[in-house]
Each structure stands twice: as structure tokens, then as C-alpha cells.
Amino acid sequence: SERCDDWGLDTMRQIQVFEDEPARIKCPLFEHFLKFNYSTAHSAGLTLIWYWTRQDRDLEEPINFRLPENRISKEKDVLWFRPTLLNDTGNYTCMLRNTTYCSKVAFPLEVVQKDSCFNSPMKLPVHKLYIEYGIQRITCPNVDGYFPSSVKPTITWYMGCYKIQNFNNVIPEGMNLSFLIALISNNGNYTCVVTYPENGRTFHLTRTLTVKVVGSPKNAVPPVIHSPNDHVVYEKEPGEELLIPCTVYFSFLMDSRNEVWWTIDGKKPDDITIDVTINESISHSRTEDETRTQILSIKKVTSEDLKRSYVCHARSAKGEVAKAAKVKQKVPAPRYTVE
Amino acid sequence: DGCKDIFMKNEILSASQPFAFNCTFPPITSGEVSVTWYKNSSKIPVSKIIQSRIHQDETWILFLPMEWGDSGVYQCVIKGRDSCHRIHVNLTVFEKHWCDTSIGGLPNLSDEYKQILHLGKDDSLTCHLHFPKSCVLGPIKWYKDCNEIKGERFTVLETRLLVSNVSAEDRGNYACQAILTHSGKQYEVLNGITVSITERAGYGGSVPKIIYPKNHSIEVQLGTTLIVDCNVTDTKDNTNLRCWRVNNTLVDDYYDESKRIREGVETHVSFREHNLYTVNITFLEVKMEDYGLPFMCHAGVSTAYIILQLPAPDFR
């Protein structure tokens, strides 16, 4: 057959859906690969064709849109399952074509089983709440487009296995779940189950997300350098190993890049000729405040090295700080000779 | 002082009328705690003398009435056996003129002052009156565009205005008014509410509508030929499958051998907003086994059926 622009298997979109629930999957061509949308393509006379390859098979086959109760159907650029079955797992391809143009992309779809407590292999999105920050809300995700706005679904929220009822500081409000004061004890997996009717049938959508309570912006400070500091002097003899830790505390800041680096005589270690290595370790507190340690190491320090300026720098969205390490050459103890 | 600071969203209030704010913050206030109110980080607590215009009443701060100069940040400190929380509430007071159309929109009204009625439904508005037990509220009067609401579609029940069969005309500016009595003195409370109407949304355009058939029966003589159209409206750019089924099987498959009942070729007429599709089912010869069986027209997720019936005997 004639050539087709094949975008291959789009593994960026590892789509996971729950078994026995409706799923609507948009053809990724219009989302990520083509400049025009489905309506433009359709009005230009292009046809969208779907097919799939079952799990552990090589054979591409057309999708059967003539199943009982229209279990699988297509609407515009959306592939609908009402509902999914476990053996719908596979690689799905959508192809846009007419006699002169062709473009296609494949993506993996995994139908996942869940237990009665909503545990499953599903990768969970993480929603961060600021600790003790006032009222914050999470919203039941990815339910748009499943039912019209005239349908009033029933929404039930769970924390782990427990229905959220009479919780002290967590209040279900339809599609939203409100946290009056987020505390560490609110960390966990939260599930909304949306139940809606369609054509005499009742469908359930299960959405689980992980809530992580993090440091509040009102408590955030610029980076704090704990080491080096004025109380520690790195006194070495030539030939000894020089180890200087730079330990920096970063308040949690949403979407902030935390950086730590050393300069030696104002230059980055890579830009100077001395044999220096830097090892980094990172630890986090329960509220995702971060402590980064970069250890500068010179295996055999020379007297020249001991005269250099060693400065630790740190930067976050809150600001930039720097601190010089106190490095000096150890004065040899005087030798007394007995005449 | 070791107190944890908690910041509440701003409250926007109107001058010259009572206002109260309750310092409760579950789970903090669920145990044995003491609550003290302060203004603008002052070290002196708000008075507890009930004759004071601004005073603390149990866990509440009460303004009788609120005045323009009362804007500011108020703190309530909740002390437990081994905890302390300081809650900051930013109160902004403005002069409101509900019936002065020259005044622009109110600044960032909270949800209590923006409410929704649903078109075609029996719905309600709520008058949010949050005051301590020491305040006695009289019956509530409701106004729309500055006129008292009268009429059989409206009923006042407790703090609710019940609205029957909501129409588009019910959108607009409402106010609820109540007389509050405290220590023998009377004050007027007037809350403005901006009401919008949500339309009765159709099926987002993506669910096809079957115009005919309508889940009904058709009288037809045994042995005759019958053609029934399924008429469907759908969006211009839909990709829905339209077909006839019996016993959950496509009629062309179900009658594959005899070909006695067949699905016709689909045609469509294009309109400005939608397409009208027609796909027929042809019974070359109606047999006894066809009676009482639902023949289903499917269009995407929509379905409708016909059932063939023997005509009633004519005894003339």
C-alpha cells in the first residue's frame, strides 16, 4: 500500500484504564503530532480509521464496532469503550487518511484490574497540598466528556479503603474534596467513584490520586547553607585529602529547581586543572523540604590548593546564597632539637 | 509564641449591618480549647462585653453593626492543651448599594453571594445568615432587582427561597433581608446574591438522537412486505455507526442465510447544524416469528425499537 507517515508507538502515552469501566481515548495524532484538529481534517475529507494489535500478538486487526450494546464505538476523534474488558489490552492505532494523505500513530492501552480497596498497578497522579494553609481542594480527575452536563452523577470519595464520611478536616463536595487544614495525616491515596446513567445502564468511573502534604509557601525561605560555616576550619597538610561538605536546606517550593554548586577561585571545578571530584546526596523531609549535600574532594591537596577560595553556592526560586569554606594549611608543629 | 499560623480566604462584607465570624477549625476546635480574638496583631483581645459594638461571643467575633473602618486582619488564637493555632481572617468592608445600578460589580464575591438556579427545575436559593445563638433572626424577606418577591412560583421556607419551574427570567440580583435582635436591639441584615441560570444542557452534541422509531409497535399483516426507516440526527463530524439489530445481532448477520430481513443503504441530508441520517430495515415477508420481537435501531449509544403486532381482528 502507499506510504503512510508512521509516528510509531507513542510510549509517552502509557494509557491505563480500569476493567469494566467506560474509557474515552482521544487519537493522539491531533493532540501531539499534527497541526490541525479533527474537525479540520474531517471537513477536508480525511477519514479516521482505528485498528489494534492484541497483547502478545503481531497481527493488526480492525476494531469491531459492531459489538452488542455498542461496547466499542467511535465519536469524532475519540475511541469509546462502554465498558472495557481485560482483553482489550493492546496497542491501538489511529490512522488519518484519504487517497493522497496518510498519517498514523500507535499507543499502548492497558486494562487494569483493581481490588475492593482500589489497589491496582495503575500509576497514580500526585497532588500536593500545602501544610496548614487554609482550605484546599482536589478535584476528581479525567471525568470530563463522559456524560453531559444535564446528567447529575453520584460521587463517592474514599481515603484508602474508607468512605469519607464525618472526617474531621476532609469534606466531600461533589467532584471536589476539600481539606480544611491539610496535615501530614492526610497523606495517602484518595479515590473518587463517579456513578452516572446512560441509556438505561449505570457506569462507574474510578479515579485514584495520591495526596502528598508539602511545606507551605508561607513558611518558605531562601536556601540555608548549614555547611560550610564559620565554625569549621578545614586545616590540611599538603598530600592529605581535602573533603568539604556543602549542605543546603531548601524549603519545599512547587516547581522550583534547587541547585547547589561549588566554585574554586570563582570558576566551576570542571574549568580548572586540579583533580577534584564532587559527590551529591539528596534527602527529603516528610513535607518534601530538601537537603542537598555536595562533597568536594581533592585526593592529594597541594599547598597551592590550600590557598584557593572554595565557595558553595545554592539557588532556588526563593533566592541565591553563597558561603566560603575556611581552608588553611596546617602549620607544622615546631621541632625541638636537644643539643 | 509557638502558635501555628493559618490564613483564611478574604471575607468581603458590607457596612452598616451585623456580621459575625465563627472561629472553628476542625480538628483543632473539637477538643478542650480556648478561643481569643484580636484585631491587627494587637496584644489586647477583643472585648467580651456584650454591649460593645465589636465583641467576642463564645467562639464568634460579632460586629453590631460592621462599620467601614472595621476592615483589617483579625486573628483568633485557639489554644489547646498542647497546641496553639492562630487563624488570620482578612475582612474588607465596603459600602454597598444593592439598588444603585451605577455601582459596578462587587469585588470578588464569595460563593454564598453567587448562586445558581437550574433551568426547568424546582430549585432554591439560600440566605446565608451565620450568627451566634445570642442573635435571634426574624423571618426572611426576599427581593429581586430591589422589588419584594411575590408570586406563586416562589415560597420562603426558613432560610430558603424555593423557586418552582426555574425560567431564564429568574437570573438577576437578589437580596435576602432579615431583622436580627441582640440584647433587645434590632438590626437589619441584607445579603445580596447574584443568580445565574444554568441551561439544560443537551447531550454535548456527541450523542445521536433517534427521531423515529420511538419504542412502539406497528400493526402489520402476516406475509406483507414492510419497510421501516430509522431517522437519526447527529453532529456534522460524527463517526457514529447506525444500524438495525435483532437479539443483539446485526439483522444482515441474523438473517444471513434467508436474507428475508435486510438493512438498507444509509442516506443523509445535511443541515446547517447537524445531519439527518436514514437507514431502513426491509421485511421482504413478515412471518409469525417476527411478531413481539424488538427490532432495534442503533445510532452510537442511542437505541430505539419497533415491535411488530398482528392487527386486531375485524368482526364487522
Epitope: - | H118, D122, T155
Partner: antibody, heavy 118, light 107 residues
Framework: EVQLVESGGGLVQPGRSLRLSCAAS????????MHWVRQTPGKGLEWVSV????????AYSDSVKGRFTISRDNAKNSLYLQMNSLGTEDTALYYC???????????WGQGTLVTVSS | EIVLTQSPATLSLSPGERATLSCRAS??????LAWYQQKPGQAPRLLIY???NRATDIPARFSGSGSGTDFTLTISGLEPEDFAVYFC?????????FGGGTKVEIK
């Protein structure tokens, strides 16, 4: 054609619970408030409870407050009345009724009989 | 709560006669009053709402009047099927309340 069909009534001992259901058809269920009304030979008609279309407004008569709970499932076109701590004074024919102008009743079911007796 | 008192308790009339039923409220219910008809073994049926509006499919011989605390249901010419019990009901205040009923019987 509007139809309201109650179920769940029966003989129950004092202090026990019962759940009544009402299946609605023939109208757009989630446009209207729904009510429970009961009737006894001695006390005549007595309004029990109301629930708005979206369950936002709920009210009870003083005689059942704290013991009865009204609820609805618009997806199933169903109205419910959970009755706890039943007493002999709750013996009645229970009707479910569709709200008209909110708090009039333009359609009624045929009723389900609840008898509380030891 | 608002108490509705109906009178008379029983009204004995012949077919074709005019029936006048009264309902008095313990406090004003404005125009929020309805009338229902109930026949033995059947559920009540809405006749009149908001004092004077006839419900769907209710014949013109049924009419309502009054305001505030005093209300009247009039049946201009009794038909055989009109012999039943009639209740009034208010929706001005919670709890919603009914009158005790007036029985219209054949004389």
C-alpha cells in the same frame, strides 16, 4: 404516564428499622422535589419529609426528625425513606409524592403499609 | 406549625347540588393552599393549587377561592364521582400540614 410505585413496607417490631423505596417513571425525575406523606385512620394525612432535586434541601416533620432519613438516586429514578427506631405511632400507609410548585403534591403512589407492632 | 381546620366534617348533598367546603388556617398562608380529593382505597388527587388554580385534567366545576386564613372549595354541581373526602394543605411554612378532611356523601 406518571407512575410512582412504593415498596418496602411490612410488619416490623418497635425499635427496628425499615427502608421504603419509590420507583418513579413518566417524568423527568431529577427536575422535581419529592416527598413522603403518611396517612393513618386516626391522624389523617401527615407530611413526613421532602428532598430537593439535587438533595440540597431536605426537611422533616418534627415527629420523625432524627429517626428518618430521606434520600434519592436520580440515576435510578428512585426515592428512599430509611426509618429507624420505629414506634407504634409510625404505623401508617406511606405515600411517595411528586412535588408541584415544590410543596404541593400532583402525583401520588398507591402507598405501602407499614405496621409497627410487637 | 400551621393548623388547618376544615368544616363541616361531613356534608350530605344530592347529585347536582352545590358543595361549599371551608378551610381555615391558624395563621396566614398567603395564597399557598391546595385542595385534594381522596376516594376509598385510592391515593389523594390534586384538584386545586395556589388557592384557585385547577390542576391538570380537573373539571371546571371545581373552583377555589380565599386568601390569608379563610379558603373555600366549591363544587358547582355534584357528579356521582365527586362523593369523596376532601383535604386542604398549606405550603407556606414547614412542616407542610393538611386539614382533617371533609367527607362529601350522598344524601
Amino acid at each position: 404516564e406518571v407512575q410512582l410505585v412504593e415498596s418496602g413496607g411490612g410488619l416490623v417490631q418497635p425499635g427496628r428499622s425499615l427502608r421504603l423505596s419509590c420507583a418513579a417513571s413518566g417524568f423527568t425525575f431529577d427536575d422535581y422535589a419529592m416527598h413522603w406523606v403518611r396517612q393513618t385512620p386516626g391522624k389523617g394525612l401527615e407530611w413526613v419529609s421532602v428532598i430537593s432535586w439535587n438533595s440540597d434541601v431536605i426537611a422533616y416533620s418534627d415527629s420523625v426528625k432524627g429517626r428518618f432519613t430521606i434520600s434519592r438516586d436520580n440515576a435510578k429514578n428512585s426515592l428512599y425513606l430509611q426509618m429507624n427506631s420505629l414506634g407504634t405511632e409510625d404505623t401508617a400507609l406511606y405515600y411517595c409524592a411528586k412535588g408541584h410548585n415544590w410543596n404541593f403534591f400532583d402525583y401520588w403512589g398507591q402507598g405501602t403499609l407499614v405496621t409497627v407492632s410487637s | 406549625e400551621i393548623v388547618l381546620t376544615q368544616s363541616p366534617a361531613t356534608l350530605s348533598l344530592s347529585p347536582g347540588e352545590r358543595a361549599t367546603l371551608s378551610c381555615r388556617a391558624s395563621q396566614s398562608v398567603s395564597s399557598y393552599l391546595a385542595w385534594y380529593q381522596q376516594k376509598p382505597g385510592q391515593a389523594p388527587r390534586l384538584l386545586i393549587y395556589n388557592v384557585a388554580n385547577r390542576a391538570t385534567d380537573i373539571p371546571a366545576r371545581f373552583s377555589g377561592s380565599g386568601s390569608g386564613t379563610d379558603f373555600t372549595l366549591t363544587i358547582s354541581g355534584l357528579e356521582p364521582e365527586d362523593f369523596a373526602v376532601y383535604f386542604c394543605q398549606q405550603r407556606s411554612n414547614w412542616p407542610l400540614t393538611f386539614g382533617g378532611g371533609t367527607k362529601v356523601e350522598i344524601k
